[in-house]
């Protein structure tokens, strides 16, 4: 079944964590429907973004952050694993120094801390895609 | 009550038609939430695009038009007469020589035909909305 | 082993221009940002400027904002630093650094001294 | 004026605790790392992401940060631990600031 988009969760994050994304876009890649990910470091969708993880299917994909409600310098890629019409699975996992992004499996992009991963707060996924998983898996320590 | 989006509805316009939308950003204008209509020549989402209408909400919007499966010479606005947070109603009415487009009442652009109003055969209203008024009116002969 | 070696130091005049160097090797010089923090004498470090590891992006601290010009080439394994329109407050030992994955100054170069006087 | 604020001078006796301070950043955004100066030489890096050691830095070396505030503490201060100690973080991500810095004499 279908989870609400925009879809919101409060989380925890650290050295360790996963956040795994399962959907589908709503639109042909020819139409450029996006897909976001915003991790926030409060529940109120205005508050600053850790890591802001933004595809533009079939394009390209951009990641940055958002300080004291600025953003900051963007990382573009034209990498694009990401199937017209298809399914994909992200995974976002933290490691000590970056956010590594794969994309069905494969790892497809990083993005170096900013701001620690500790900060976050909440995630949101949202934009032109149907979500069916959504799980943040912890380290068990 | 909501109507599902992407919204897609078959329409066949000409001179005297409008089409008019109601509905709601899904996000504040920080996170800049997107509104999309575009009037199509086929029922298909992959068809050309006779206006290409596109609100980045406080920041833009882009008008366009999609001939042969290309983007050709995009026009921009920083008009801006949407408000973070509020319902609007938009209106595309079919004049002559262009369509015209009042926001909550308030002519704010215009776009010059390229392709025939009659070529279009369906509409398509999507992106970071919910929608509550989907309608085209046509003149009486 | 990180080797970081600045060049190009000197005496110049108040209002003058000097272009200091830093050769790289023991690393994948274009895998890494790099930056300039300079230290002048008997004072604290600053950061001066950084660069990304393609050198598109540049930043820039707000006290040689629209003066000084980082600049990299990957192919020769060199950081580069244009200082314009100097000031006797630029004057300072300037060091080479490898920024390391949290955005911290991994290695050091020896330094080399600017000193901007009439 | 830095926006990092460090004791100017602090002094330890041979083998024991030395906590350097460092106030007025925004560390439960920004990692902090600190840097150890001897006279005549360039920095050395001992602490990088609030608490991680890189290699070749002693154990006795650690660091924390809480709120306000991050420490670098020397369990143990040895008499070749005498020297400048800079803390650095940030103002935002792409602007890098360090603290005035902190003169540690081992006694």
């Known amino acids: 079944s279908l989870l609400p988009v925009p879809y919101t969760e409060a989380a925890s994050l650290s050295t360790g964590s996963t956040v795994t994304i399962k959907g589908r876009p709503l639109a042909c890649f020819l139409n450029e429907p996006y897909l976001q990910v915003d991790f926030h470091t409060e529940m109120k969708e205005e508050s600053d973004i850790v890591f802001h993880f933004q595809v533009c299917f079939g394009r390209r994909v951009v990641m940055n952050s958002r300080e004291y409600g600025a953003w900051k310098q963007q990382v573009e890629s034209k990498n694009m694993p990401f199937q017209d019409g298809q399914e994909f699975e992200l995974s976002i996992s933290v490691l000590p120094d970056k956010y590594q992004v794969m994309v069905n499996g494969q790892s497809s992009y990083t993005f170096d801390h900013r701001i620690k991963p500790e900060a976050v707060k909440m995630v949101q996924v949202w934009r032109d895609i149907s979500l069916t998983k959504f799980n943040v898996s912890y380290l068990k320590r | 009550s909501l109507l599902p989006v992407p919204y897609t509805e078959a329409a066949s316009l000409s001179t005297g038609s409008t089409v008019t939308i109601k509905g709601r950003p899904l996000a504040c204008f920080l996170n800049e939430p997107y509104l999309q209509v575009d009037f199509h020549t086929e029922m298909k989402e992959e068809s050309d695009i006779v206006f290409h209408f596109q609100v980045c909400f406080g920041r833009r919007v882009v008008m366009n038009s999609r001939e042969y499966g290309a983007w050709k010479q995009q026009v921009e606005s920083k008009n801006m007469p949407f408000q973070d947070g509020q319902e609007f109603e938009l209106s595309i009415s079919v004049l002559p020589d262009k369509y015209q487009v009042m926001v909550n009442g308030q002519s704010s652009y215009t776009f010059d035909h390229r392709i025939k109003p009659e070529a279009v055969k369906m509409v398509q209203v999507w992106r970071d909305i919910s929608l509550t008024k989907f309608n085209v009116s046509y003149l009486k002969r | 082993q990180v080797q970081l070696v600045e060049s190009g130091g000197g005496l110049v005049q108040p209002g003058g221009s000097l272009r200091v160097s830093c050769a790289a090797s023991g690393f994948t010089f274009s895998s890494y940002y790099m930056s300039w923090v300079r230290q002048a004498p008997g004072k604290g470090l600053e950061w001066v400027s950084a660069?990304?590891?393609?050198?598109?992006?540049?930043y820039y601290a707000d006290s040689v904002k629209g003066r000084f010009t980082i600049s990299r080439d990957n192919a020769k394994n060199t950081l580069y630093l244009q200082m314009n329109s100097l000031k006797s407050e630029d004057t300072a030992v300037y060091y080479c650094?490898?920024?390391?994955?949290?955005?911290?100054?991994?290695?050091w170069g020896q330094g080399t001294q600017v000193t901007v006087s009439s | 004026s830095s926006a990092l604020t460090q004791p100017s001078a602090i002094s330890v006796s041979l083998g024991q605790t030395a906590r350097i301070t460092c106030q007025g950043g925004n560390f439960g955004y920004y990692y902090v790392s600190w840097y150890q100066q001897k006279p005549g030489q360039a920095p050395v890096q001992v602490i990088y992401?609030?608490?991680n050691r890189p290699s070749g830095i002693p154990e006795r070396f650690s660091g924390s940060s809480s709120g306000g505030t991050a420490t670098l503490t020397i369990s143990g201060a040895q008499a070749e631990d005498e020297a400048d100690y800079y803390c650095?973080?940030?103002?935002?991500?792409?602007?890098?600031?360090f603290g005035g810095g902190t003169h540690l004499t081992v006694l």
């Open positions: 992401g609030d608490s």
């Open positions: 650095l973080s940030y103002e935002s991500s792409d602007y890098p600031v």
């Open positions: 650094v490898q920024n390391g994955g949290i955005w911290s100054f991994g290695s």
């Open positions: 660069i990304n590891s393609g050198g598109g992006s540049t």
